[in-house]
Structure formats: structure tokens, C-alpha cells
Amino acid sequence: MVADPPRDSKGLAAAEPTANGGLALASIEDQGAAAGGYCGSRDQVRRCLRANLLVLLTVVAVVAGVALGLGVSGAGGALALGPERLSAFVFPGELLLRLLRMIILPLVVCSLIGGAASLDPGALGRLGAWALLFFLVTTLLASALGVGLALALQPGAASAAINASVGAAGSAENAPSKEVLDSFLDLARNIFPSNLVSAAFRSYSTTYEERNITGTRVKVPVGQEVEGMNILGLVVFAIVFGVALRKLGPEGELLIRFFNSFNEATMVLVSWIMWYAPVGIMFLVAGKIVEMEDVGLLFARLGKYILCCLLGHAIHGLLVLPLIYFLFTRKNPYRFLWGIVTPLATAFGTSSSSATLPLMMKCVEENNGVAKHISRFILPIGATVNMDGAALFQCVAAVFIAQLSQQSLDFVKIITILVTATASSVGAAGIPAGGVLTLAIILEAVNLPVDHISLILAVDWLVDRSCTVLNVEGDALGAGLLQNYVDRTESRSTEPELIQVKSELPLDPLPVPTEEGNPLLKHYRGPAGDATVASEKESVM
């Protein structure tokens, strides 16, 4: 499959730097090479390397980061890094994280407002429903795979010796004690933020205070704002606001155009940041390895648990998700995955699906031919609610802890773990180590001890990265699947399902290119049947 050159909103081939290192105006051969085609002659090899330069640099960066980290931690002596030196060492990586986080807010808000405003409400609902169904099913599959692997490999029984070395009380203070109900109420509260400005950097969370009520000590839930972007609330607001703007018709067009332009400008910034990504990733990975005190001992003690998590992630990411993609699209899923290697490596480096979002949007649009209105609508939602990796890890961890503490798991408990992991992974909301916090909810739900969460935390630096890679891969494949659904629906129907708002059209009329025509865009036909005139205003819902 050779991808067509991506187009900008004017229907012209974009001439900005792309995710794969070349320009979007590269020749068809280059496009083929970029999409994972074969490189034969020396010329083709050169073109292939140029087209995949960023991908190669990113992969090299991860490997170099591991090597650098092991080298520095192994050297010791004069090279030994204290806390102050370590922060200087990881500074290039910190810079990447800051750049990516800087871009998240405008990107998520503008892309979702623009995406929701450019879609017919009915189709928006259908698209959202299919996306959520895909996310739900894949997360459940990941959970089931996690439980199955852990029951088969028995990592807890093999790792029981670690109990002896961590002491009887494995630091239960690390385990957040929160009622299951309060966790889900907090999730609902965050969906409807009371202050949009503070939602950009704070989330709502319930804590507990002990109060004396009639001589009895009672644990009273107390709400407070905690550090960390409430991405869930911003996503919901942006979608609803986009739908509202569309309802305004011509009056809302100026604002829609503003958000679309803002979004395009943000994506230009992303394309610049992408070239810095390999440097940042290298130092993030190296820094984390240097930070670990005794990686070898950790692997010796928790090796089977780590293996279980990583094997689960590998099976789900390299077999299950690609198989689902192939069954529905009949396209090569590994070619699709090749197109998103850079964001996958960034996910590994940053350990945050939110931070990977900008690069993922760029790559799925330019390398994998996913339409902007789909990627910019689906990916932010996916980054917020689709947590295959987290669900799988939580299930493995729950079974691991059950085995470690010799607590039985009957059928009801296993189902409870599956359902709770699937539901609570939604609440993890793309923040690093969010999975460990929601793990406590699962353990409480099936009465398992929370003492051993400290063991999970010990290897979270590695498992969480693997989780993030799987999370963002699921988002991207979801976007690819929906693109295929849209293409199929369009080819079946003579009257496409969606209306494109006027603001999506260029100021000077140009024929709408075939790439932009899709079932999510309704065009009113001119006298000659040309789909050149977009509706002035959608019909009122």
C-alpha cells in the first residue's frame, strides 16, 4: 500500500517537514519507502534512509540511551552521578518533556474543538461510539491477557523470595488508600471541571480527614485540587464546545477557523520538536537507568513479574492489536506501526501518553494517511481513556500480589479484576505512574493486600514505559481503524454522511481533493453534481 502525499486544508500537498524526515512533497517512491517499502538500489537506499531518518534516529536514541545509562552507572568513580549531577545529566530529556507538555494544552483543545466542529453531530456520535467500543474491547482483551499470563506463568510464586528481603511490611504507606466509589466520583467530577483555567494544570481528588463526631473518629472525604492537568475535563469541554460552535452555523465559522489555524500552527511546532525528540529520548532513558540503584538485583528478584508484563504488552501490541487491525482493514498492520515508530519511542522515553500525543497526530496523518479530523478527534480521546497497557499491567500486578501473599483467586474475583482494571484504567488519564494508583483500587475491590505495591513501584519505571507504548499504539490503531471505517462507508454511500463546515474550505475556491472527501463530510451538490459547494449552515439538530 503506497500512501498518497498528505494534503493540507487547502487540498495542496503539504511542504512542511514530516515525521519521517523528508518533505511531504517527496516522490511516490519516497512515500513507499517511508511506509515500510523495500529499498533496493543504492539510490533507493539513500532515499529510504532519508525518508526514515527520524525513525532511525529515534530507535538509535533509545539504544544509545540504554548503553549510555549502563555505561555511566557501571563506570562509577569520577563518573558517579549524585542527585545534582543527575538532574544536569537528564536536562536534555527534561527539555523534551517540557516542550511536549507545552504543546499538549493548545493541541488537545484546538484539535478537538476543530474536529468536533467539522463533523456532523450524528456522525460525530457514531465515530465516538465506534472509537469507545474499540477502546473498551481492546482494554478488556488486554486485561484478560494479563490475567491469563499471570495465572500461567505464576510470577508471584516465583518471586515470593522478595518478601523476605523487603521485610514483612512492604511499606504500605506507599499504597494510596482510597475508596473505590470516591475514585469513580472523582473521575466524574473531573469530566465536568468547575474552572477551565485551573483544569489546565490541576485535577480534583478526594482525600480523607479523621474527625471526632460524637466521640467517634470518622473518616470524612475532603475534596481538593491536586497538581496535574485535568485532561479528561478539557477533552469533554472541547468536544462539547466544538459541537456548540457548529450549531451556531455561520456565526461560529470565524472561531472554528481560528481554532483550526491555531491547530495547524501547533502542528508546525510539533514538526520542529520532533527533530529534537531523539536527543531528549536518549537522555531520558539513560537518566532513568543511572537513577536505578541495582537494576540487576531488581531483575533477579522481580524478573518473572517484569517478564509477564513485558511479554503481555508484546503479545497485545505485536499480535492482538495488529490482528484486530488486519481483520477489519485487510491492510498490513506492521506497515502502519512502522509509520508511528517515532511516537512509540517517544512514549517509551517520556512514559506519558499525553506527551506523545503531538507526535502521534503528526505521524498518523503524514505517514499513515489518517484524515486530520479523525486523528485530531480520536487521538486526544484515546490518550485520555484508552489504557490497554495500564489495564494489562494492573491485572498482572493483581494476580502477582495474590500469588505473592498466597491469596486465592476464584472466578468472581478474576471477573472483578478484569472489570475494575478496564474501568479504572480510564481514570489513569495519561499521567506517568497513574496505573500504580489505580492498582490500589483493584486490590481493594478483591480484598488483596496493598503492602506489596512498593514492589510494583520498584519496577514501575520500566513497566510504565512499556504500558505507555501499548496505550499510544492502541490509540493510533484505533484512529487507523476508524479511517478505514470512514473510507468504507464513503465508498458504499452515494450521499456522504457528514457536512464540512464552510471554514474548512480555502478562501479562494479550489476543488475538494479526493483525500478530503469522506463520509464524515457532507457536500451539497452543485448543478453539475460537483461536490464543490459546502453547506452554509447545518440543519438544526
Partner: antibody, heavy 120, light 107 residues
Framework: QVQLVQSGSELKKPGAPVKVSCKAS????????MSWVRQAPGQGLEWMGW????????IYGDDFKGRFVFSLDTSVSTAYLQISSLKAEDTAVYYC?????????????WGQGTTVTVSS | DIQMTQSPSSLSASVGDRVTITCRAS??????LNWYQQKPGKAPKLLIY???RLHSGVPSRFSGSGSGTDFTLTISSLQPEDFATYYC?????????FGQGTKLEIK
């Protein structure tokens, strides 16, 4: 029915070792953890630790690291508590107790207890 | 470690009386509170686990309640065989810890 039968009372001199056994019957031995609990004369109950009967791994309470060793012989469904270099303050009744496989940490069946007296 | 405090440390009651023993944890233990009965020279026996669940073979006159930090064991109508020492134990976090015991004597 579930039964835990412990070895008989022991009278030992300070510095000597002692080994207490606890034979389990009426259930699958390797499914439930086995805990050890100490009760000094006229005192309350004190959890010493437990042994993972499937993996054979002992987990000791903070006050019972060093001279105390938990072990198993799964072929005869028996758990052992060995104390080396006995001291006068080790005089107590030692109970083995089956750790429930549910609701975290509690002990649903207990052995009858083994009295260990350390006296010169 | 979590401290468990029982009250009273001893109490006298008559056959047929309703008796309540309380147990307080130094921190929230949710419902992971268990009660044991021990008679002189005998091993402890589990009565109630997870705050209110009766262990098999335990008479229904025994009941438990509470949540968080404050718990109670109630014997609705004392029988002669109920005179013993009762211990509460938290099972929330390692290490499991016991209360100092409540000795129930005949008045």
C-alpha cells in the same frame, strides 16, 4: 476437617537450639500460608511471620529476624520453626496458624501450641 | 506498625447478659478486623473475620460491627462456655497485630 498438630513441650538450656513441628491435615497444604504466633506467659499474641507454602519462602516479622527460621517439608505437609541460641525471653507458647487465603491476613485454624521453656 | 487497643481489658458479666467489647486501630484498617477467643491453656479460635463474618461453627450469638478505626464484638446472650479472653487483630497491613486482649469473667 482441618487440623494442625504440633510437637510436644520442650525444656531447653540457654544457647541451645529447638525445632518445633506443625503437621497439617484436612486441606491442600501448599494452598495456604502458614503463620507462627508467639505468646509469652501472661502476655498477648505476637505475630512472628509466615511461610509461603507453595514457594517455600519464609517472611519474618521485624522482631524475629536472625535466630528464627521457618521451613517446610511438603511431602509430609509439615511446617517447622527453628530457634537457635535460645534466650530466657524466648520462653513462650508457640502456635502455628493457617493463614486464610482470603481477606488479607487472618488465621482460621490454629495448632494446639508448643510450650518452649528456656531455663538454666 | 498498626496499634490495636481493646477496651475494657477485663469485664465481669453473668450468663444471659449482652456484652460488648470494643477495639480501636491506630489508623484506618477498613473492614480487616478479626476476633479470636482463647480459653486458658488452649489455642486461640477464630470467631469473626472481616469485621462481621462468622467463622464456620461459631454460634450466631456472636456478632461484629464497625469500619475504619472503631470496631465492636457483641455477645447477645452470654453462655457459660463464653467466659474466656478475646483478642482483636487487624489484617489490613503487614505485620498483623493483635489487641492486648479482654478477659471476660463470671460475675
Amino acid at each position: 476437617q482441618v487440623q494442625l498438630v504440633q510437637s510436644g513441650s520442650e525444656l531447653k538450656k540457654p544457647g541451645a537450639p529447638v525445632k518445633v513441628s506443625c503437621k497439617a491435615s484436612g486441606y491442600t497444604f501448599s494452598t495456604f500460608g502458614m503463620s507462627w504466633v508467639r505468646q509469652a506467659p501472661g502476655q498477648g499474641l505476637e505475630w512472628m511471620g509466615w511461610i509461603h507454602t507453595y514457594a517455600g519462602v519464609p517472611i519474618y516479622g521485624d522482631d524475629f529476624k536472625g535466630r528464627f527460621v521457618f521451613s517446610l517439608d511438603t511431602s509430609v505437609s509439615t511446617a517447622y520453626l527453628q530457634i537457635s541460641s535460645l534466650k530466657a525471653e524466648d520462653t513462650a507458647v508457640y502456635y502455628c496458624a493457617r493463614r486464610s487465603d482470603n481477606y488479607r491476613y487472618f488465621f482460621d485454624y490454629w495448632g494446639q501450641g508448643t510450650t518452649v521453656t528456656v531455663s538454666s | 506498625d498498626i496499634q490495636m487497643t481493646q477496651s475494657p481489658s477485663s469485664l465481669s458479666a453473668s450468663v444471659g447478659d449482652r456484652v460488648t467489647i470494643t477495639c480501636r486501630a491506630s489508623q484506618d484498617i477498613r473492614n480487616y478486623l478479626n476476633w479470636y477467643q482463647q480459653k486458658p491453656g488452649k489455642a486461640p479460635k477464630l470467631l469473626i473475620y472481616y469485621t462481621s463474618r462468622l467463622h464456620s461453627g461459631v454460634p450466631s450469638r456472636f456478632s461484629g460491627s464497625g469500619s475504619g478505626t472503631d470496631f465492636t464484638l457483641t455477645i447477645s446472650s452470654l453462655q457459660p462456655e463464653d467466659f474466656a479472653t478475646y483478642y482483636c487483630q487487624q489484617g489490613h497491613t503487614l505485620p498483623p497485630t493483635f489487641g492486648q486482649g479482654t478477659k471476660l469473667e463470671i460475675k
